[in-house]
Interface confidence: medium
């Protein structure tokens, strides 16, 4: 038992309209879906479209990144009156969709979110029988996904002058706030990089010159968690090497 | 026919970890998936979580630090677990039943739903 | 998130009357809007969907209306045995949202 729900209105901030006879080509979509990573998110669109009753071929395609160019992630077909739209892509497996094309519904669903899921995805349609027509979200919907911090790498590097430096780079959504702690620091933010282009959620903090032998340990905080990681610097004296 | 039960200690002490059982019937855990609802004595319903029939997870993300949810689909049991709890924890819990995924056209929405249980948390 | 106002919190019927609740959501939600009953003491029950979408088994005397964010259950002839705590549900986004309830009593 399928229940349909459309909304056919255009009061929508993210409705998008192409002027037809009778019904017209419409989508509707959130602006955003937020969600946290390692969850799963429902991105949901809607359509409405002029050609009544029909049930021939079609295919529903999501795309990310940008609209008709980006990427697919997804897209299934469905044969002449059918009601399944079988999958012919998935990207890892991941994307499934929930929605009954047959019934203007491609929400899809996508399992285990990870920060680089967080972009702007399209859905589209296409007919593909008697009649030959195709509709796509221009603006799409944002899938805005947020994470606890991660320490993804902290080491310690040589320097000119013998000397020694720290760095520590960490992942989150938002991004999160590093602070270095160890001999003779008390709580430093050292020398914190903005997230790289590209690399959004990464935040490195370096610590210059480390003057002093011990552990120095990197803290990242965000509104949703912290992590902590710790390396050590020991120098052989009267030697030019250290063990970390 | 369709039952979801709730089950698990009706008190629990300020900052230990709330735990709570849903055992259902009449349908399969590999189809359906089962959502956590909670109302505070004379409040109205907050959700917590859903679990989807193929174990995927989404969380209310004010909730999500403190809640842990899994299932034994063979046990048809999906369980709850709340940790850290406070006073404002307390509530009648309720686990309901998330419609089939596939093509429903409905897809937060709770068709059935249990009796309820009420955790109390107190010292 | 999305915030659902439900007005008004309580009413007072009289047997046979026709009974309206409404329910704003804070952004659009293109009708994917539910609306639970719960009757004292008891679990709630799911009675639309979909906005307007009458559950089987829901009396016919229920209805739902609306559209983008605003909408209504309207219950066309008051009966005994509606008295309830009705809820209103938005699922086009998560966190999923329910109204604060309406409290529907009889004169």
């Known amino acids: 038992f399928v229940r349909t729900k459309i909304d056919t209105t255009e009061n929508l901030l993210n409705t998008e309209v192409h002027s037809s006879p009778a019904q017209r080509w419409s989508m509707q979509v959130p602006p955003e879906v937020s969600a946290e990573a390692g969850d799963a998110a429902v991105l949901p669109c809607t359509f409405t479209h002029p050609h009544r009753h029909y049930d021939g071929p079609l295919t529903a395609i999501w795309r990310a990144g940008e609209p008709y160019a980006g990427p697919q992630v997804f897209r299934c077909a469905a044969a002449r009156g059918s009601e399944l739209c079988q999958t012919a892509l998935s990207l890892h497996g991941r994307f499934r969709l929930l929605g009954n094309p047959r019934r203007n519904d491609l929400s899809l669903r996508v399992e285990r979110l990870a920060l680089a899921d967080d972009r702007r995805y399209f859905c589209r349609v296409e007919f593909a029988g008697d009649v030959h027509d195709r509709y796509e979200s221009r603006h799409g919907v944002r899938l805005h996904v947020t994470a606890a911090p991660r320490i993804v790498n902290i080491s310690v590097l040589p320097s000119p002058a013998h000397a020694f430096r720290a760095l520590c780079t960490a992942e989150g959504e938002p991004p999160p706030a590093l602070a270095w702690s160890g001999p003779a620091l008390g709580n430093s933010l050292a020398a914190v990089r903005s997230p790289r282009e590209g690399h959004g959620h990464l935040v490195t903090a370096e610590l210059p010159a480390l003057t002093h032998d011990g552990r120095y340990t990197c803290t990242a905080a965000n509104s949703l968690g912290r992590s902590e990681a710790s390396v050590y610097l020991f120098r052989f004296h009267g030697a030019s090497g250290a063990s970390t | 026919q369709v039952q979801l039960q709730e089950s698990g200690p009706g008190l629990v002490k300020p900052s230990e970890t709330l735990s709570l059982t849903c055992t259902v019937s009449g349908f399969s855990l590999s189809n359906y998936g089962v959502h956590w609802v909670r109302q505070p004595p004379g409040k109205g319903l907050e959700w917590i979580v859903l679990?989807?029939?193929?174990?995927?997870?989404t969380y209310n993300s004010a909730l999500k630090s403190r809640v842990t949810i899994s299932k034994d689909t063979s046990k048809n049991q999906v369980s709850l677990k709340l940790s850290s709890v406070t006073a404002a924890d307390t509530a009648v819990y309720y686990c309901?039943?998330?419609?089939?995924?596939?093509?429903?056209?409905?897809?937060?929405?709770?068709?059935?739903w249990g009796q309820g249980t009420l955790v109390t948390v107190s010292s | 998130d999305i915030q659902m106002t439900q007005s008004p919190s309580s009413l007072s019927a009289s047997v046979g009357d026709r009974v309206t609740i409404t329910c704003k959501a804070s952004?659009?939600?293109?009708?994917?809007l539910a609306w639970y009953q719960q009757k004292p003491g008891k679990v709630p029950k799911l009675l639309i969907s979909g906005a307007t979408s009458l559950e089987t088994g829901v009396p016919s005397r229920f209805s739902g209306s609306g559209s983008g964010t605003d909408y209504t259950l309207t219950i066309s002839s008051l009966q005994p045995e509606d008295v309830a705590t009705y809820y209103c549900?938005?699922?086009?986004?998560?966190?999923?949202?329910f109204g604060g309830g309406t409290k529907v009593e009889i004169k």
């Open positions: 549900q938005q699922y086009w986004s998560s966190p999923l949202t």
């Open positions: 679990i989807w029939s193929d174990g995927s997870t």
């Open positions: 309901a039943r998330h419609p089939y995924d596939d093509y429903s056209g409905y897809y937060y929405t709770m068709d059935y």
């Open positions: 952004d659009h939600i293109n009708n994917w």
